[in-house]
């Protein structure tokens, strides 16, 4: 039975030509995490697997920097990176856990921080 | 363009080890897996393990742990997987196979013309 | 492990008519909170290593005839030739590509009748 929830950081904004870091924590569980992957909804990101480390996607190489933890930081922002990001954790016995983020990418200076939420 | 190219057919008996070379060309060695499968005489693909040159880091089928080691040479663009205490179910072709990113997914979009080895005393 | 199961094991089929192999994996490959599932189908001809044909369960790979064709979802899939040609005479894996390890199914073999 699944019992883990993952906390995202929700809602977030960042300014053009800046950088964010995407988190998600995966709780109420003692299942092992195998491998975490970073994805867009049609576009893998980067994986944190326990075993081979951190691999980045060719494509984002450039902008896409690990961490911190299991999170991912993303530079270099356009406002074609807006959207939704997922973060797949495989654990072990559990299965899979996804969390959401949505980012939005603004021209102006004025970038807020959403409210965090969890997805069971 | 993509090449993987590997080491030509081996003959070992029972209880000897054997090391594979995979050598890389036409991309960036270091920003993709390189996985290792093998198929036996008339037989399925079986997977093996991967690697992942950019880091060192390596997992493995649990069937090969223990038995099965596989490296990466950056400065060479080469990788190797080595089989130890061969036996004869281990005759079989091993290919080396590039992990692309294909949207969401690993897929294993080049592959090594594969390396026949032979397992007999 | 994911358990990936081909059937059938063998198919003869009439050049021009349609082939379907089916594959099942024991958990479900389906990542429902992207709605994406990870499976791919293989190729291999005599003497030659695999070669992709579909990904993601129902993409083609770049370069593939359209008589080529995945669907199915979650545990239950599907790979359908819709006119066999000769050149599509080969052994066909499905492979598990959801999580470590990435296994592939026992395979089909497809010949001509």
């Known amino acids: 039975m699944m019992t883990g929830t993952i906390e995202t950081t929700g809602n977030i904004s960042a300014e053009k030509g800046g950088s964010i870091i995407l988190q998600c924590h995966l709780s109420s569980t003692t299942a092992q995490v195998t491998q975490v992957n970073w994805e867009q909804q049609d576009q893998l990101l980067a994986i944190c697997n326990a075993d081979l480390g951190w691999h980045i996607s060719p494509s984002f190489k450039d902008r896409v920097a690990p961490g911190p933890g299991l999170g991912l930081t993303l530079q270099s922002l356009t406002v074609n990176d807006t959207g939704e990001y997922f973060c797949i954790y495989h654990t072990y016995p559990d299965g899979t856990y996804t969390g959401r983020i949505f980012l939005e990418v603004l021209e102006s200076s004025v970038a807020e921080h959403g409210a965090r939420f969890q997805i069971p | 363009q993509v090449q993987l190219q590997q080491s030509g057919a081996e003959v070992k008996k029972p209880g000897a080890s054997v090391k594979v070379s995979c050598k890389a060309s036409?991309?960036?060695?270091?920003?993709?897996?390189i996985e290792w499968v093998r198929q036996a005489p008339g037989q399925g693909l079986e997977w093996i393990g991967v690697?992942?040159?950019?880091?060192?880091?390596?997992k493995y089928n649990e069937k090969f742990k223990g038995r099965a080691t596989i490296t990466a040479d950056k400065s060479t663009s080469t990788a190797y997987m080595e089989l130890s205490s061969l036996r004869s179910e281990d005759t079989a072709v091993y290919f080396c196979?590039?992990?692309?990113?294909?949207?969401?997914?690993?897929?294993?979009?080049?592959w090594g013309q594969g390396t026949t080895v032979t397992v007999s005393s | 492990d994911i358990v990936m199961t081909q059937s059938p094991d063998s198919l003869a089929v009439s050049l021009g008519e349609r082939a379907t192999i089916n594959c099942k994996s024991s958990?479900?490959?389906?990542?429902?909170?992207?709605?994406?599932?990870?499976l791919a189908w293989y190729q291999q001809k005599p003497g030659q290593p695999p070669k992709l044909l579909i990904y993601?369960?129902?993409t083609r790979e770049s370069g593939v005839p359209d008589r080529f064709s995945g669907s199915g979802s979650g545990t239950d899939f599907t790979l359908t030739i819709s006119s066999l040609q000769a050149e599509d005479v080969a052994v066909y894996y499905c492979?598990?590509?959801?999580?470590?390890?990435?296994?592939f199914g026992g395979g089909t073999k497809l010949e001509i009748k």
């Open positions: 196979a590039r992990t692309g990113v294909y949207g969401n997914f690993l897929i294993f979009d080049y």
């Open positions: 036409g991309y960036a060695f270091t920003n993709y897996l």
């Open positions: 993601g369960a129902s």
């Open positions: 958990q479900s490959l389906l990542n429902s909170g992207i709605q994406k599932n990870y």
């Open positions: 690697i992942n040159p950019g880091s060192g880091g390596s």
């Open positions: 492979q598990n590509d959801h999580r470590y390890p990435f296994t």
